[in-house]
C-alpha cells in the first residue's frame, strides 16, 4: 500500500518494526515538501535480508523519474548496499521510498528505522541552467530565491533577466554617437531600445557602424533572438545581427528611428554607431579685401555659419551700415543667406571742437581715417593745455580719436592767468595818486554794477572784481551784499548784477564783454560790523572769451602769512581819483567824480602791527584781523577809494612769473582816501584759496600748476 507524507519532517519504519517484518510485503511512502526545499533521508537502523543486487528484500529511494538508491542486507558488500551513515538527498521536493519483502525469509530480520526532513535548496549556488539562473544578482532565502539587477537596470517580468529602459533617446545634434546599453560590455537582456535622431529639415542623416559589432544570431534563421532595425519614414532597414556590421547607411532623411531588441538570453557585446548630418553644399566663399571669414573651410554645408570680420582699422559695411562682424549662413537650398559684405576703413570723422582750442591735421588731405593723426592746441597765450598734454590724437581702430593719456576725452584748455598782454611798467607815478591804465594792462579787472530793483527807489552801485577763470569773478563780499538793513547779510539777487570785462573807459562799454550772474556767493562768515571775511564770488551766466583785454589773474598759494611787508603791489579801479573831492561833493555831483578811464596805483604792503596800531589809535571800533592786510604810504597821497571795492591787489610772483591776486579792496579809515597814515585795508586772499576752489568746483591741483611752474 501507499502512504502520503506532507510534513516537513518525519519517521518511516518497516512494518512491525522493531520486530521482524512480514514476508511478501510492499509499502510505499510518498514524501512531498514545498517548492524550494529538497528531502534529506537517513537511516538509524537497517537490517534486511541479504541478496544479490537486492533481489529479495529491499528499500528503494526514488523521485518521479530517477532511482536515487536501493538498499538491502546488513552491511555493504560488492553486490549489495546498506545505507549506513549515508544521507539520501532528493533533487526536488518529492521523494518516494518503497519497502519490499519476498515470500520467504530464512531468518528473522528486524527491518529499518528511517528519518526524513525538508532542507532548503540554495538556488543561487545550484542553478546551472542559464534559462533559470539570475541575470545579475541572486538572493537565496529558506524555501526560495529572488533576482535583482545592477544600477540602471530593471528586473524583467520573468523575475530573472535584467533589462534597461532605453526607449526614450532623442538626438538633435548634427553629429553624435549611439551605442547599445553598457557598450562595450554585454548588452542587457529582454530590452527594447528606441533611438530617435531628429534633425532640422534640410539635413540628411548618415549612419556608420564602428568598432565592435556583436549581436546574438542563429546559423540558419535570420536574427531570431536579438537585432537592430532602422526605420526611415515607412521604410525599415534590417534586421541586423551577428558579427559583421552593416555598411554605412545614407538615410536621405532628417528623421531616423533605430530599434534594438534583445531576448532573455545570450552574452553579446553589442554595437556602436556614429551619425553625421549632411546638407546641401554652398558655393565657395571669398573673404573681402582687408577682411577674413571664420571658420575657413574647404566646403560649407547647410547650416554652416561663417563670421565675416575685417582687419584692424576696418569695419564691416553691409547695406551702408557699419558693424564689427557680419554672420552669414548656408541655407538648406545650398545658397548663402547674404552676400559677403565689404570692409571699409574706419573713419573717426571730424574731431570734436575744443573749447578755446584749435585742431591741426598731421595727415595729408585732412584725412580722418584709421591711423590718421590730429593735434589739438590751445588758443595761446590766453589758454594752456592742462597737464602739458601733447594734444596728439590718433584715429583708433574703434573709430574714435584717442590720446595716449586722456583716451577719448578731449584735452582741457585752461585759462592762462596773471599774464597781461602788455607788460606792466616797472615805474609807476607817485584811483588817488595813480595814473591811467593802458588797455590790456589789467585784463582781469572787472567792473561790477549792481542795481537792486527790490527797493523803491532802486539802488545802484558798483565795485571792482578780478577774473579768476572764464566763468568766475572774485570780489569783496560787501560789494555784493544787499545795501540796506545792515544787520543782515543778504546777497543781492543775481538778476541785479552785471559784470563788465575788458573795460577801459566806462563811457565806452562797446568794446567790453558784459555778462549777467548765474550765482552770487558771499563768504558765509562775512561780518558786516568789521568786514572780516570780506570775500565773494560771482559765477557768470556764460564763460567769457579770453583775449588780450580779458584774462584771469592767478590765485596765490595757501599762505596764512599773506604778502610780505613792503612788497609792492598794484591795484586798479574806476573809483574816486581826486583826493580833494569831499564826500559832500560826491553826493551832489552823483557819479561824475568817478574816473572814466581805469586808474591804477602801486602800493607797498604795510607791516600788520603798524596797520593795527594806526587804526587802534583812532576813535571808533576798527578791527584789522588776520584775514586782512594793509597797503599804502604813511604820508598818504596814493590809495584806493570809493568805487574801487572788490578790486584786486596784485603782486608779481617771481617764481611763476605771473601776477597773483593777494588782496581785495575792502575798507579804509574815516578820513578821506589818501590821507596821511590812513592805510587801505585789503582782504587777505591767501587765507581763502581752498574756499575759492571749492566754490568754483575745481580741485586745487587742476589749476595750481598753472601758477607754480
Amino acid at each position: 500500500h501507499t502512504v502520503e507524507l506532507n510534513n516537513m519532517f518525519g519517521q518511516i519504519q518497516s512494518p512491525g518494526y522493531p520486530d521482524s517484518y512480514p514476508s511478501d510485503s510492499e509499502v510505499t511512502w510518498n514524501i512531498t515538501v514545498p517548492d524550494g526545499f529538497r528531502i534529506k533521508l537517513y537511516f538509524m537502523h537497517f537490517n534486511l535480508e541479504s541478496s544479490y543486487l537486492c533481489e529479495y528484500d529491499y528499500v528503494k529511494v526514488e523521485t518521479e523519474d530517477q532511482v536515487l538508491a536501493t538498499f538491502c542486507g546488513r552491511e555493504t558488500t560488492d553486490t549489495e548496499q546498506t545505507p549506513g551513515q549515508e544521507v539520501v538527498l532528493s533533487p526536488g521536493s518529492f521523494m518516494s521510498i518503497t519497502f519490499r519483502s519476498d515470500f520467504s525469509n530464512e531468518e528473522r530480520f528486524t527491518g529499518f528505522d528511517a528519518h526524513y526532513m525538508a532542507v532548503d535548496v540554495d538556488e543561487c549556488k545550484e542553478r546551472e541552467d542559464e534559462e533559470l539562473s539570475c541575470d545579475h544578482y541572486c538572493h537565496n532565502y529558506i524555501g526560495g530565491y529572488y533576482c535583482s539587477c545592477r544600477f540602471g537596470y530593471i528586473l524583467h517580468t520573468d523575475n530573472r533577466t535584467c533589462r534597461v529602459e532605453c526607449s526614450d533617446n532623442l538626438f538633435t545634434q548634427r553629429t553624435g554617437v549611439i551605442t547599445s546599453p553598457d557598450f562595450p560590455n554585454p548588452y542587457p537582456k529582454s530590452s527594447e531600445c528606441l533611438y530617435t535622431i531628429e534633425l532640422e529639415e534640410g539635413f540628411m542623416v548618415n549612419l556608420q557602424f564602428e568598432d565592435i559589432f556583436d549581436i546574438e544570431d542563429h546559423p540558419e534563421v535570420p536574427c531570431p533572438y536579438d537585432y537592430i532595425k532602422i526605420k526611415v519614414g515607412p521604410k525599415v532597414l534590417g534586421p541586423f545581427c551577428g558579427e559583421k556590421a552593416p555598411e554605412p547607411i545614407s538615410t536621405q532623411s532628417h528623421s531616423v528611428l533605430i530599434l534594438f531588441h534583445s531576448d532573455n538570453s545570450g552574452e553579446n557585446r553589442g554595437w556602436r554607431l556614429s551619425y553625421r548630418a549632411a546638407g546641401n553644399e554652398c558655393p565657395e566663399l571669398q573673404p573681402p579685401v582687408h577682411g577674413k571669414i571664420e571658420p575657413s573651410q574647404a566646403k560649407y554645408f547647410f547650416k554652416d555659419q561663417v563670421l565675416v570680420s575685417c582687419d584692424t582699422g576696418y569695419k564691416v559695411l553691409k547695406d551702408n551700415v557699419e558693424m564689427d562682424t557680419f554672420q552669414i549662413e548656408c541655407l538648406k537650398d545650398g545658397t548663402w543667406s547674404n552676400k559677403i559684405p565689404t570692409c571699409k576703413i574706419v573713419d573717426c570723422r571730424a574731431p570734436g571742437e575744443l573749447e578755446h582750442g584749435l585742431i591741426t591735421f598731421s595727415t595729408r588731405n585732412n584725412l580722418t581715417t584709421y591711423k590718421s593723426e590730429i593735434k589739438y592746441s590751445c588758443q595761446e597765450p590766453y589758454y594752456k593745455m592742462l597737464n602739458n598734454n601733447t594734444g596728439i590724437y590718433t584715429c583708433s581702430a574703434q573709430g574714435v580719436w584717442m590720446n595716449k593719456v586722456l583716451g577719448r576725452s578731449l584735452p582741457t584748455c585752461l585759462p592762462e592767468c596773471g599774464q597781461p598782454s602788455r607788460s606792466l611798467p616797472s615805474l609807476v607815478k607817485r584811483i588817488i595818486g595813480g595814473r591811467n591804465a593802458e588797455p590790456g594792462l589789467f585784463p582781469w579787472q572787472a567792473l561790477i554794477v549792481v542795481e537792486d530793483t527790490s527797493r523803491v527807489p532802486n539802488d545802484k552801485w558798483f565795485g571792482s572784481g578780478a577774473l579768476l577763470s572764464a566763468s568766475w569773478i572774485l570780489t569783496a563780499a560787501h560789494v555784493l551784499r544787499s545795501q540796506r538793513r545792515d544787520t543782515t547779510v543778504i546777497p543781492v539777487s543775481k538778476e541785479h548784477v552785471t559784470v563788465y570785462l575788458g573795460l577801459h573807459d566806462v563811457r565806452d562799454k562797446s568794446g567790453a564783454v558784459n555778462s549777467s550772474a548765474a550765482r552770487v556767493v558771499l563768504h558765509p562768515d562775512f561780518n558786516i560790523q568789521n568786514y572780516n571775511h570780506d570775500i565773494a564770488l560771482v559765477q557768470l551766466q556764460e564763460p567769457v572769451p579770453l583775449g588780450p583785454h580779458v584774462m584771469p589773474v592767478c590765485l596765490p598759494r595757501l599762505e596764512p602769512e599773506g604778502p610780505a611787508p613792503h612788497m609792492l603791489g598794484l591795484v586798479a579801479g574806476w573809483g574816486i581819483s581826486n583826493p580833494n573831492v569831499t564826500v559832500d561833493e560826491i553826493i551832489s555831483s552823483g557819479t561824475r567824480t568817478l574816473s572814466d578811464v581805469l586808474q591804477y596805483v602801486k602800493l607797498p604792503v604795510v607791516p600788520h602791527a603798524e596797520c593795527k596800531t594806526s587804526y587802534e589809535s583812532r576813535s571808533g571800533n576798527y578791527s584789522v584781523t588776520e584775514n586782512m592786510f594793509c597797503a599804502g604810504y604813511y604820508e598818504g597821497g596814493k590809495d584806493t577809494c570809493l568805487g574801487d571795492s572788490g578790486g584786486a591787489f596784485v603782486i608779481f610772483d617771481d617764481l611763476s612769473q605771473r601776477w597773483v591776486v593777494q588782496g581785495l579792496v575792502s575798507w579804509g579809515g574815516p578820513e578821506e582816501c589818501g590821507s596821511k597814515q590812513v592805510y587801505g585795508v585789503y582782504t587777505k586772499v591767501s587765507n581763502y584759496v581752498d574756499w575759492v576752489w571749492e566754490q568754483m568746483g575745481l580741485p586745487q591741483s587742476v589749476v595750481e600748476p598753472q601758477v607754480e611752474r
Epitope: V456, P457, D459, W461, Q483, R485, D486
Partner: antibody
Framework: QVQLVQSGAEVKKPGASVKVSCKAS????????IEWVRQAPGQGLEWIGE????????NYNEKFKGRATFTADSSTSTAYMELSSLRSEDTAVYYC??????WGQGTLVTVSS | DIVMTQSPDSLAVSLGERATINCKSS????????????LAWYQQKPGQPPKLLIY???TRESGVPDRFSGSGSGTDFTLTISSLQAEDVAVYYC????????FGQGTKVEIK
Amino acid sequence: QVQLVQSGAEVKKPGASVKVSCKASGYTFTGKWIEWVRQAPGQGLEWIGEILPGTGSTNYNEKFKGRATFTADSSTSTAYMELSSLRSEDTAVYYCLRSEDVWGQGTLVTVSS
Amino acid sequence: DIVMTQSPDSLAVSLGERATINCKSSQSLLASRTRKNYLAWYQQKPGQPPKLLIYWASTRESGVPDRFSGSGSGTDFTLTISSLQAEDVAVYYCKQSYNIPTFGQGTKVEIK
C-alpha cells in the same frame, strides 16, 4: 497804477492772533519788498519788518521777532502779516507799504477783553 | 537801532511862509558804496496813511510840489516847505532805511 489793498478791521481778545492781508496790483509783486508799519492811536509810526515775496527773505524789528510772521502768496499777489500773543498795547492801525513809496489804506486791529 | 530825533515837535507857520523841520540820526546814514543818504520824509494827514515826499535825503518823489525840498548828509537832515499852503497842514515824519528802519517822532505843522 500801483495799489495796496488791506483787509478789514479786526477785534481780538488778548492772547489771540490776528492775520492781516495786503493785496498788491499794478507791478511785479515778487520783485519788491513789502514792509509792515503800525501806528498806535495818536502815536507815531513803528516799523515791524519786511518780506521779499519772490524769495521769501524776511527782516524783523527785534521787538517783534517771534511774534510777527510774514508770508506771501505769489499766485494771488498777497502778503500777510500774522501777529500772535496779542496784548492791549498792540491796538493800532497796521499798514503795508511797497518798500518806501506806496502805502495800503491801513487795517485797525483792536485788542480788548 | 538808529535813533531819529525830529525838531520841533510842532510848528505854526503863516500861509506862504517857510517851514523848516530838522531830523538828526544817531549815526551816519551815508552809504559809501552808493554814496546815498538813506533818509526819507513822509507827510500824514488825519485818517490817511503816510505819503512819501522825499527819498535819498534830497530827491523829490514824482508828483510832489516843488515847494518841498530836502537837504543834509550824514546825520543832519532838513525838510523845507518854501511857501506853506493850507493843504500842507499835517504831521511830517523822517525815516531812515540805512539800517532796520526807524521813524522820527513826528512834527506837527499848523497854520499860524
